[in-house]
Interface confidence: medium
């Protein structure tokens, strides 16, 4: 008989895990960019749109050099959870105008969920403290009008785009330290 089977294996080395997390983040960034362009084509944005409930951008590109792995992953996970919640809200309460963004919005939600699970596994593999699940956040108020829903969509996709762009840069930089 051959050698005894090794221990049961769960998944790749965390560095390989980080590689695939970067790939998934890049692909999500491309999806978001495409969806934002689709939204602009259908409903041109008149200036910048903000939504108070969205997280503030985590980091300027210039400050990336000082990043520490635990802080980046914790902050990124928290921000992406917020965006996931906003995308779910948009699909539920955004009104009939935004139905034209389906099924792409649904695909975006599923990929965002997958990225969050990947980040969670990466954090646990490295033995970084896992924040306990957040208490249920108060529900987001429905948009006041159809145009309110469109403005919210511009803000959500724009913010997610910036966050994912920051995430790709941050994760690539962290890879050199792992």
């Amino acid at each position: 008989p051959g050698p005894p089977p090794g221990p049961p294996r769960v998944s790749p080395d965390p560095r390989a895990e980080l590689d695939s997390t970067v790939l998934l983040t890049r692909s999500l960034l491309a999806d978001t960019r495409q969806l934002a362009a689709q939204l602009r084509d259908k409903f041109p944005a008149d200036g910048d749109h903000n939504l108070d409930s969205l997280p503030t951008l985590a980091m300027s590109a210039g400050a990336l050099g000082a990043l520490q792995l635990p802080g980046v992953l914790t902050r990124l996970r928290a921000d992406l959870l917020s965006y996931l919640r906003h995308v779910q809200w948009l699909r539920r309460a955004g009104g009939s105008s935004l139905k034209t963004l389906e099924p792409e919005l649904g695909t975006l939600q599923a990929r965002l969920d997958r990225l969050l699970r990947r980040l969670q596994l990466l954090m646990s593999r490295l033995a970084l403290p896992q924040p306990p699940p957040d208490p249920p956040a108060p529900p987001l108020a429905p948009p006041s009008s159809a145009w309110g829903g469109i403005r919210a969509a511009h803000a959500i996709l724009g913010g997610l785009h910036l966050t994912l762009d920051w995430a790709v840069r941050g994760l690539l930089l962290l890879k050199t330290r792992l």
Epitope: P14, L69, R125, A127, L178
Partner: antibody, heavy 118, light 110 residues
Framework: EVQLVESGGGLVQPGGSLRLSCAAS????????MHWVRQAPGKGLEWVAV????????YYADSVKGRFTISRDNSKNTLYLQMNSLRAEDTAVYYC???????????WGQGTTVTVSS | QSALTQPASVSGSPGQSITISCTGT?????????VSWYQQHPGKAPKLMIY???HRPSGVSNRFSGSKSGNAASLTISGVQAEDGADYYC??????????FGGGTQLTVL
């Protein structure tokens, strides 16, 4: 082959100290968090301590807090457990284990026996 | 850091399905989907059978499955075989970033 090998166990008197080592091979040690888990004779598994991939985060069971210190040397692919003020109830087989998921440990050493007795 | 609660022993005949329960609190099992199960034969190191509540590592038989509801988790072995006779331990990540094990369950295959 992915492997963990513990050493450093032995007989020690109550109040004494011992340092356990766990040599890792076959994987990128510096990319994984690591645990120590113990098992007293005829008893169940008891979690002892965990250390993050770079040594910056360490957590301990209440029963060993202030007496045991977990550390690692990534340049030597080695995990350590410094045990001070040992008590009879610390008598056990001590295992090091690699983190696979938050509490999941997919690679274990063969264990090293620590006996605390006068 | 109280141990998770498991039955001391369970038994079953070959081919039967058996379930081992593991009860914790809202600070461990109830807080995360981070529950693992280990098999340990006498004199051997534990072996990971289930992680993250219901995920099976490669190389573990699909007869082993895990689930969770509230503050309790369970391991089910379908079509139990003689070689499954061993001690089984559950464990959970906690809100203190520590890990807690169950007291262990001895599975006897009749």
């Amino acid at each position: 082959e992915v492997q963990l090998v513990e050493s450093g166990g032995g007989l020690v008197q109550p109040g004494g100290s011992l340092r356990l080592s766990c040599a890792a091979s076959g994987f990128t040690f510096s990319s994984y968090g690591m645990h120590w888990v113990r098992q007293a004779p005829g008893k169940g598994l008891e979690w002892v301590a965990v250390i993050s991939y770079d040594g910056s985060n360490k957590y301990y069971a209440d029963s060993v807090k202030g007496r045991f210190t977990i550390s690692r040397d990534n340049s030597k692919n080695t995990l350590y457990l410094q045990m001070n003020s040992l008590r009879a109830e610390d008598t056990a087989v001590y295992y090091c284990a690699r983190i696979a998921a938050a509490d999941g440990m997919d690679v274990w050493g063969q264990g090293t026996t620590v006996t605390v007795s006068s | 850091q109280s141990a998770l609660t498991q039955p001391a022993s369970v038994s079953g005949s070959p081919g039967q399905s058996i379930t081992i329960s593991c009860t914790g609190t809202s600070s461990d099992i109830g807080a995360y989907n981070y529950v693992s199960w280990y098999q340990q034969h006498p004199g051997k190191a534990p072996k990971l059978m289930i992680y993250d509540v219901s995920h099976r590592p490669s190389g573990v038989s699909n007869r082993f499955s895990g689930s969770k509801s509230g503050n309790a988790a369970s391991l089910t072995i379908s079509g139990v075989q003689a070689e499954d006779g061993a001690d089984y331990y559950c464990s959970s990540y906690t809100t203190s970033s520590t890990v807690v094990f169950g007291g262990g369950t001895q599975l006897t295959v009749l």
